[in-house]
Interface confidence: low
């Protein structure tokens, strides 16, 4: 009679992670009599997944019955494969021996592939806020992939971008992958309602990428631009000053009027309007009494926001008897007016 | 070889950088590691640069530390330094083009951080 | 994120005899595990990589083992130029990644 041949006649099985695997055996023969053992690997160090004779292999069912003398098929089922399960596999084939079973013949081998999903990709931008012009990195992570293939896509608000690079973790063998990849971006001043997406593509999410976003809200800061102005005269003696606050986010803000260098008043950005962009206006006012001064009173409107140093911008009032209409101020920050705007 | 430069005694709060200067080796080939030991404690990684010029980092070590290359040199810069930061300074090669394997390792440069 | 555990923390060896040093990880990291040798004042060195492959230049004397989550280095034949602090660290991945490192092992050679 023809000698026993072990039959394996999948050299390689794909399975997805959580899934059951299903490893095919069969011998040729009846004889000799003796037991079945599947191994993961070859060798002295090979890891047994199951055994005919002895023993409790929660996770494997056989697919037969094995107990039945007639039996020739000796495939198993894996329930619950997670990418750890991954390697070749061995249905042996043992001869009857006293006082231990001998190794008779081996299968040729079953390579188990697990392919599992990437995690959500998690996007984190930088640690702090940054001005428009500026690049700014966001990272993107996922995890516990496998294949190893898995492409990698940023996008800003719909368009792609190309400035990123991208490593995937390890760069040899390994039952799962991570990948991590870092991507540049250009700060403008209408980023406020922006997002960053990253997209992960595998073959296990059927052409469904996974996205992680980012809001560029978290990220950007849009300094305010300052500008003070001097309403016509409301009483004899008074004048009103108004210092517009325009395009700032976030709305994290302090002005502070000062009379000649002398803080007058501090208050906070409350009641503010929200621009279409998503950034912020504001406007405070201040009510000088004229005949409180007999020299002239250079007013100063320093704002504060987001914790940044302080910008300024200053208009300068003259006393005198007759009142006249008065313009604005447009002189750069930090500096008084080169227009002397005259009461 | 690798040799760390640029450790001395700095007060809290000043920026200090440290640079890798490497030969014999091309930094298109292989990522590059910064590692530090505190007196008497044991080795904390830092982070990597890829060979594109790429960075990872510890979870601790993300906003505090700034790596950056040129094609001989890779430089970490520690941007606020408290007392905690002072340490030996390890500049380390990676065995590939990638994250792995520590292979060539630099004498190390001590930062001293006090008032 | 993946955490590396040595044991013991110190542990004392006699000329000639064997010391072995565990280290576990908290993930499956198959065999992308390595050791290092570092003695005072000196920089860390490269004495096996892939959990068990010894690098150039490094004494038969040491051995790696393990894979998955649980690794071994033991040092037999141990001689006084021993004497070192010795570390594990997982070459699998960086990702959230707080140390790459065990926390270390001083052997001390009596």
């Known amino acids: 009679e023809e000698e026993l041949q072990v039959i394996q006649p999948d050299k390689s099985v794909l399975v997805a992670a959580g899934e059951t695997a299903t490893l095919r055996c069969t011998a040729t023969s009846l004889i000799p009599v003796g037991p079945i053992q599947w191994f993961r690997g070859a060798g002295p160090g090979r890891e047994l997944i199951y055994n005919q004779k002895e023993g409790h292999f929660p996770r494997v069912t056989t697919v037969s019955d094995l107990t039945k003398r007639n039996n020739m098929d000796f495939s198993i089922r894996i329930g619950n494969i997670t990418p750890a399960d991954a390697g070749t596999y061995y249905c042996v084939k043992f001869r009857k021996g006293s006082p231990d079973d001998v190794e008779f013949k081996s299968g040729a081998g079953t390579e188990l592939s697990v392919r599992a999903k990437p995690s959500a990709p998690v996007v984190s931008g930088p640690a702090a806020r940054a001005t428009p012009q500026h690049t700014v990195s966001f990272t993107c992570e996922s995890h516990g992939f496998s294949p190893r293939d898995i492409t990698l896509k940023w996008f800003k608000n719909g368009n792609e971008l190309s400035d990123f690079q991208t490593n995937v973790d390890p760069v040899g063998e390994s039952v799962s992958y991570s990948i991590h990849s870092t991507a540049k971006v250009v700060l403008t001043r209408e980023d406020v309602h922006s997002q960053v997406i990253c997209e992960v593509a595998h073959v296990t999410l059927q052409g469904d990428p996974l996205r992680g976003t980012a809001n560029l809200s978290e990220t950007i800061r849009v300094p305010p631009t300052l500008e003070v102005t001097q309403q016509p005269v409301r009483a004899e003696n008074q004048v009103n000053v108004t210092c517009q606050v325009r395009k700032f986010y976030p709305q994290r803000l302090q002005l502070t009027w000062l009379e000649n260098g002398n803080v007058s008043r501090t208050e906070t950005a409350s009641t503010v309007t929200e621009n279409k962009d998503g950034t912020y206006n504001w406007m405070s006012w201040l009510l000088v009494n004229v005949s409180a001064h007999r020299d002239d009173v250079k007013l100063t409107c320093q704002v504060e926001h987001d914790g940044q140093p302080a910008v300024s911008k200053s208009h300068d009032l003259k006393v005198s008897a007759h009142p006249k209409e008065q313009g604005s101020n447009t002189a750069a920050e930090n500096t008084g007016s080169n227009e002397r705007n005259i009461y | 070889s690798v040799e760390e430069s640029g450790g001395r005694l700095v007060t809290p709060g000043t920026p200090l950088t440290l640079t890798c200067t490497v030969s014999?080796?091309?930094?298109?080939?292989?990522?590059m590691h910064w590692v530090r030991q505190a007196p008497g404690k044991g080795l904390e990684w830092i982070g990597i640069?890829?060979?594109?010029?790429a960075t990872s980092y510890a979870t601790w070590a993300k906003g505090q530390f700034t790596i950056s290359k040129t094609s001989t040199t890779v430089d970490l810069k520690i941007t606020s330094p408290t007392t905690e930061d002072t340490a030996t300074y390890f500049c380390a090669r990676g065995d590939r083009d990638g994250y792995a394997y520590f292979n060539i390792w630099g004498p190390g440069t001590l930062v001293t951080v006090s008032l | 994120q993946i955490v590396m555990t040595q044991t013991p923390f110190s542990v004392s060896a006699v000329v000639g005899g064997t010391v072995t040093i565990k280290c576990q990880a908290s993930h499956n990291i198959g065999s992308w595990l390595a050791w290092y040798q570092q003695k005072p004042g000196q920089r860390p060195k490269l004495l096996i990589y892939?959990?068990?492959t010894l690098a150039s230049g490094v004494s038969s004397r040491f051995k790696g083992s393990g894979s998955g989550t649980e690794f071994t280095l033991t040092i037999s034949g141990v001689e006084s130029a021993d004497a070192a602090t010795y570390y594990c660290q997982q070459g699998y991945g960086i990702s959230y990644v707080h140390n790459v490192f065990g926390g270390g092992t001083e052997v001390v050679v009596k």
């Open positions: 014999g080796f091309s930094l298109s080939n292989y990522a």
């Open positions: 640069i890829y060979t594109g010029g």
């Open positions: 892939d959990a068990s």
